[in-house]
């Protein structure tokens, strides 16, 4: 069984948060994926998505969020450039597969940015800012406006406990259920 | 000590197959993703693709998609690579090499532990 | 796929000498960018990570600079255990790639 886990990233304003997120990639290479927030007490909240059907590494950017998904390597690429103090939150990959629920993508991250420029990208203690220049082919992708009712209704509180779940990725179906989520730092 | 270790050569024949083990010890197998990495004699080095070994999730590069599979054992802490319809071509020296990350999501591809790497010689 | 052109493919220089090497990609990769020091019969050694990151426990002498598409790799001073191939990795787009690799020997 794999666990249901979160990870903390902790990065300054004006840093690069640059993760990817795994999926089977015989059963999602070409469903389209988006990046969403989850903030306390709200549904998930759909910041950018890829295309549909998703496009082989074919960079999408919304504001300063760029999607890019590696149909051959089962990898989205999601970076949020420039960060700021109110990017802070829970955010998640997932995949949508109408008419059945989305899937979420392990591992959730717990964002933290804090003021006071560091000139460290991404997660690299000691390097230069990193500085994004998207490229001109990048596009803009419509997202689905639909949040399923039975979907996250809250977001876990952090917590020690394991959640597992038979498969790589997770139904969002009755997440309500899930109580404790592992926090990794 | 941490280290992968991996089996021995191999000589095959052209369209045979091989399975190459890599061994963790010495860290928690499960939290850091395999790549599969290869060097033919005189060559330069060629990445194969990668595996996460909590979920068994793999990507490929697409030369080796159809001939190449990556699993793994965690119950022994053991990464295979495995490859298919062998060709001369395929002579090289295979490494298995674990991707380092600061956080386990973040887009970092730095190999911090390689293994001592697997001779595979394909002659008729 | 992102073409690295790492540059020579050998050298010969004294011992103490300054060396540089360089790789150029084909497109911008952000700094993602890696070397690597392979000594005949052992697996390839992490040098440099992001561009510019000195692995833990790797001497002073070696660094890494560069941005969008041009990388630099320099050892400030030679030594002659720094006899080896040395290799760039990109990963600001998959798949991963390699530089050719540059033979460094000793006059």
């Known amino acids: 069984a794999t666990k249901l886990t979160e990870e903390k990233y902790e990065l300054k304003e004006g840093q690069t948060l640059d993760v990817k997120c795994d999926y089977t990639l015989e059963k999602f290479a070409s469903s389209q994926k988006a990046w969403q927030i989850i903030r306390d007490g709200e549904m998930p909240k759909t910041l950018a998505c890829t295309e549909r059907p998703s496009k082989n590494s074919h960079p999408v950017q919304v504001g300063r969020i760029i999607l890019e998904d590696y149909h051959d390597h089962g990898l989205l690429r999601v970076r949020m450039v420039n960060l700021q103090v109110e990017d802070s939150g829970l955010y998640q990959c997932v995949i949508y597969q109408p008419p059945k629920e989305p899937h979420m993508l392990f591992d959730r991250i717990r964002l933290v940015v804090t003021k006071g420029f560091s000139g460290t990208p991404g997660s690299n203690e000691n390097s230069t800012q990193n500085v994004y220049k998207i490229p001109p082919t990048t596009t803009k992708a419509l997202c689905p406006l639909y949040t399923s009712p039975r979907t996250v209704t809250q977001a876990p509180p952090k917590s020690t406990a394991d959640v597992s779940t038979p498969d790589s990725e997770i139904n969002l179906t009755n997440v309500t259920d899930i109580i404790r989520v592992p926090v990794f730092n | 000590q941490v280290q992968l270790v991996q089996s021995g050569a191999e000589v095959k024949k052209p369209g045979a197959s091989v399975k190459v083990s890599c061994k963790a010890s010495?860290?928690?197998?499960?939290?850091?993703?395999i790549n599969w990495v290869r060097q033919a004699t005189g060559q330069g080095l060629e990445w194969m693709g990668w595996?996460?070994?909590?979920?068994?999730?793999?990507g490929y590069v697409k030369k080796f998609q159809g001939r190449v599979t990556m699993t793994r054992d965690t119950s022994i802490s053991t990464a295979y690579m495995e490859l298919s319809s062998l060709r001369s071509e395929d002579t090289a020296v295979y490494y298995c090499?674990?991707?380092?990350?600061?956080?386990?999501?973040?887009?970092?591809?730095?190999?911090?532990?390689w293994g001592r790497g697997t001779l595979v010689t394909v002659s008729s | 796929d992102t073409q690295m052109t790492q540059s020579p493919s050998s050298l010969s220089a004294s011992e103490g000498d300054r060396v540089t090497i360089t790789c150029q990609a084909s497109?911008?990769?952000?700094?993602?960018l890696n070397w690597y020091q392979e000594k005949p019969g052992k697996a390839p050694k992490l040098l440099i990570y992001?561009?510019?990151n000195l692995e833990t426990g790797v001497p002073s002498r070696f660094s890494g600079s560069g941005s969008g598409t041009d990388y630099t790799f320099t050892i400030s001073s030679l030594q002659p255990e720094d006899i080896a191939t040395y290799y760039c990795?990109?990963?600001?787009?998959?798949?991963?790639?390699f530089g050719g690799g540059t033979k460094v020997e000793i006059k």
């Open positions: 497109q911008d990769i952000f700094n993602d």
């Open positions: 595996m996460n070994p909590n979920r068994g999730n793999t």
């Open positions: 992001h561009a510019s």
């Open positions: 990795q990109q990963y600001g787009n998959l798949p991963l790639t």
């Open positions: 090499a674990r991707r380092r990350a600061v956080y386990r999501s973040s887009w970092e591809w730095y190999f911090d532990l």
């Open positions: 010495g860290y928690t197998f499960t939290s850091y993703d």
